[in-house]
Interface confidence: medium
């Protein structure tokens, strides 16, 4: 196993309706064509998978079909977008990146995006 | 607490469609995932389709892809499910389900014991 540098922002705020985006970005090495990302949610000294998805490089990102993130993949780039966040999902979210293959195999872990999440008020009558 | 009625079942030939529809009354949260479970008789209930109704991509399982549809309108509070080229296997009576999601991310959004809020169901019936 052989470290690979990986780069995210380091505060985002999610929006008002709950969806946080953010880029993670990884150091080649060499000519990987098929990558998996993982996205980690730290807090309370607990790591919690959030999501992950497997692509080859120049394809479209595929996470689950019921998984909360979507994404999108540029080169060395993966655009993530996490939906579906309340106050109490706070934390810490942290892109680990494989390239799977070929040979030999390296794994980059970054140091973690801190995702800021406000509720809104609900507002009777107009909106969920 | 969160009240869901869903409507727009009925019997319709294999080829046709349907539209389900799914409001939302006395709601806490200004958003929630919200999905469309289906069971049939002697059939364990499944996940059909799911959005966050603040945005982003919806779900689909893979006997919805291509032919279902899910929708949002958050003025009215109602969700939709658009479902076109039914088959005989669509047979199920058609639930809907929503959770305002904090914190419980990992079970996804179309596991059955995600949701805290359901209807009351809709009778769905293809004919060969």
């Known amino acids: 196993c052989k470290a690979m540098h990986v780069a995210q922002p380091a505060v985002v705020l999610a929006s008002s309706r709950g969806i946080a985006s953010f880029v993670c970005e990884y150091a080649s090495p060499g000519k990987a064509t098929e990558v998996r990302v993982t996205v980690l949610r730290q807090a309370d000294s607990q790591v919690t998978e959030v999501c992950a998805a497997t692509y080859m490089m120049g394809n479209e990102l595929t996470f689950l079909d019921d998984s909360i993130c979507t994404g999108t993949s540029s080169g060395n780039q993966v655009n993530l977008t996490i939906q579906g966040l309340r106050a109490m999902d706070t934390g810490l979210y942290i892109c680990k990146v494989e390239l799977m293959y070929p040979p030999p195999y390296y794994l980059g872990i970054g140091n973690g995006t801190q995702i800021y999440v406000i509720d809104p008020e609900p507002c009777p009558d107009s909106d969920f | 607490q969160v009240q869901l009625q869903e409507s727009g079942g009925g019997s319709v030939q294999a080829g046709g469609s349907l539209r389900l529809s799914c409001t939302v009354s006395q709601h806490t949260s200004r958003y929630y995932y919200m999905a469309w479970f289906r069971q049939a008789p002697g059939k364990e209930r499944e996940g059909v389709a799911s959005i966050w109704t603040g945005g982003g991509t919806p779900g689909y399982a893979d006997s919805a892809k291509g032919r279902f549809t899910i929708s949002t309108d958050n003025a009215k509070n109602t969700i939709y499910l658009q479902m076109n080229s039914l088959k005989p296997e669509d047979t199920a009576m058609y639930y809907c389900?929503?959770?305002?999601?904090?914190?419980?991310?990992?079970?996804?959004?179309?596991?059955?014991?995600?949701?805290?809020?359901w209807g009351q169901g809709t009778q769905v019936t293809v004919s060969s």
């Open positions: 389900a929503a959770d305002d999601r904090g914190g419980r991310w990992s079970l996804g959004t179309m596991a059955v014991g995600g949701y805290k809020y």
